[in-house]
């Protein structure tokens, strides 16, 4: 049903859902110091632009009794339950930030007639795409899936001469949220990286990932995973690997590669690690000191949910124009805006576009070093180091099947 | 001694591209960030591109999405990838070095400076 919005006269409020179910296991205090520092900047940037309103953050708690697990596998009706409880409050700001879980944003979406922005930190799954007013703020699966594909292809670089067309995933259900869904997507036979795959099969148990380490019978070299090193190790241990495997670890938002005294341990040697380029200012900022690298991702999304509402809000009051209706709703996608980090660029679906970098294990220094990044904007990569010391035969990238000879550049059309 | 020669420099027009090296002797690549800096005449120079000793590429506004940076620690030499380079590129573009105290970061100043070659983007 229609619910008024507290969004006109010069006072625009925000509702925040803070729900018990969450991608990442955040406690919802550092996301409400996140909201408030980002209202803050609000504040003063449109003070600055000299717009006279008052903008508030509303933070709607569920139902702790019903919803506890803290698990976005059991999601799915919480939104819709907090959606239900604005709707009896009459509470509802100019936009929505959260939820965070794929399950209870798609059911949303369904669910209710969106005339307002949704803002998610998460839903990665590709049941979220292509939504007209959701906008993501950490990189959905699609952004990952690019990527594989464009570098799976990729065979004219200096450490890179084929291109490969097959790989295992390794998926054995105990992933976090965000690597559930990359995963998921990476498995659905209908997605764009299975379309572009000639063989993809996915390991289940740990037994079937370690016997793949030295079968001389495997059907891919490659092996795609999503987690930190501590998972590869539990996983793998210190067991002997092939020499032509390639093992992808995802880990995109794990900024510990990026810490100065770091080494890397010797089982990450067959490893090219993905991972986003880290931000430049986070270490410092008050929401961010009690944060693990990994979490400060998820509250990052929270505060640039509100930067980027901040945005819109003084282009909308600029112009004049209003701010409840389908067009601001709309809105927020196609754009870059002044994120707490930088420039932070949504693409046309409203998705944030970011640098992912592609790290391998030095041999000679076994430190952590950049092979290559990738533009998720655009779907390019760059190349950064020309003549990496790999573990690999001849410093380079082997052939995704072993043995089968000299096709170098095999392309697909 | 720690030597930086760029070459590579040239007329191009607007739109076109060109390849900037940096090569450099008396200094491991692994240990030190390398950074590209245009001075435009009349102006003020200018930070391009830096690349931390762990190969993190970090890069100014004006050319994100438009110049790349690389290295090939075989032959001791940075590259700078500009493309789509316009009128405002114009400058002496110089490469710079620092003895790297993070691996992630940009240095705040640099120790090492190179000659320049002058880039000229005109139709």
């Known amino acids: 049903s229609q619910v008024s919005q507290n969004c006109h006269n010069g006072s625009y409020e925000i509702s925040v859902l803070m729900m018990g179910n969450s991608a990442f296991a955040e406690p919802l205090k550092n996301l409400e110091d996140a909201v408030n520092e980002g209202l803050e900047i609000v504040r003063g940037r449109l003070q600055n632009a000299g717009l006279n309103v008052t903008v508030n953050a509303t933070f709607m708690y569920s139902d702790g009794l019903i919803h506890n697990s803290g698990d976005c596998r059991s999601s799915t009706c919480e939104g819709l339950d907090l959606l239900r409880k604005i709707s009896n409050a009459q509470r509802m700001g100019c936009v929505l930030i959260g939820p965070s879980c794929t399950y209870s944003t798609f059911q949303m979406y369904l669910d209710t007639e969106l005339s307002y922005p949704m803002i998610s930190a998460g839903s990665f799954g590709l049941s979220c795409d292509y939504k007209e007013t959701l906008t993501r703020l950490m990189s959905p699966a699609r952004k990952l899936m690019y990527f594989l594909v464009n570098f799976w292809k990729t065979n004219d670089l200096p450490f890179k001469t084929y291109s490969w067309s097959t790989s295992y995933v390794y998926k054995n259900g105990t992933e976090t949220e965000d690597c559930f869904w990359y995963l998921n997507a990476l498995e659905a036979s209908v997605s764009y990286f299975s379309h572009e795959l000639g063989f993809k099969v996915v390991l289940r148990q740990d037994k079937e990932f370690q016997d793949i380490l030295m079968d001389h019978n495997r059907k891919s070299n490659v092996i795609i995973m999503c987690g930190g090193p501590e998972f590869l190790y539990k996983l793998k241990g210190d067991r002997a690997v092939a020499e032509d495997i390639v093992i992808i670890l995802v880990d995109l938002f794990n900024d510990q590669y990026f810490e100065d005294n770091v080494t890397a341990p010797d089982y990450m040697k067959n490893v090219l690690v993905l991972t986003l380029s880290p931000g430049n200012s986070l270490l410092n900022s008050s929401f961010s000191r009690n944060l693990s690298p990994t979490k400060r991702d998820f509250a990052l999304a929270y505060l640039n949910g509100i930067l980027l509402f901040g945005h819109m809000l003084k282009i909308f009051l600029e112009n004049g124009e209003n701010i409840t209706t389908p067009k601001f709703a709309h809105a927020f996608r196609n754009l870059t805006f002044e994120g707490y980090d930088g420039p932070v660029t949504l693409d046309d679906w409203g998705d944030v576009d970011s640098t992912m970098v592609l790290l391998y294990t030095s041999v000679d220094t076994k430190k952590y070093k950049v092979l290559l990044t990738y533009d998720t904007h655009v779907n390019k990569t760059y190349p950064v180091d020309m003549s990496p010391t790999f573990t690999w035969k001849n410093s380079k990238l082997p052939n995704d099947i072993t043995g089968r000879g000299p096709q170098h550049h095999h392309h697909h059309h | 001694e720690v030597q930086l020669v760029e070459s590579g420099g040239g007329l191009v027009q607007p739109g076109g591209s060109l390849r900037l090296s940096c090569a450099t002797s008396g200094f491991t690549l692994d240990d030190y960030a390398i950074g590209w800096f245009r001075q435009a005449p009349g102006k003020e120079r200018e930070g391009v591109i830096c690349l931390t000793s762990g190969g993190l590429p970090k890069y100014a506004d004006s050319v994100k999405g438009r110049f790349t940076i690389s290295r090939d620690n075989s032959k001791n030499t940075l590259y700078l990838q500009m493309n789509s380079l316009r009128a405002e590129d114009t400058a002496v573009y110089y490469c710079?070095?620092?003895?790297?105290?993070?691996?992630?970061?940009?240095?705040?100043?640099?120790?090492?400076w190179g000659q320049g070659t002058m880039v000229t983007v005109s139709s």
């Open positions: 710079a070095a620092s003895g790297a105290t993070s691996r992630w970061n940009c240095p705040p100043q640099y120790d090492h």
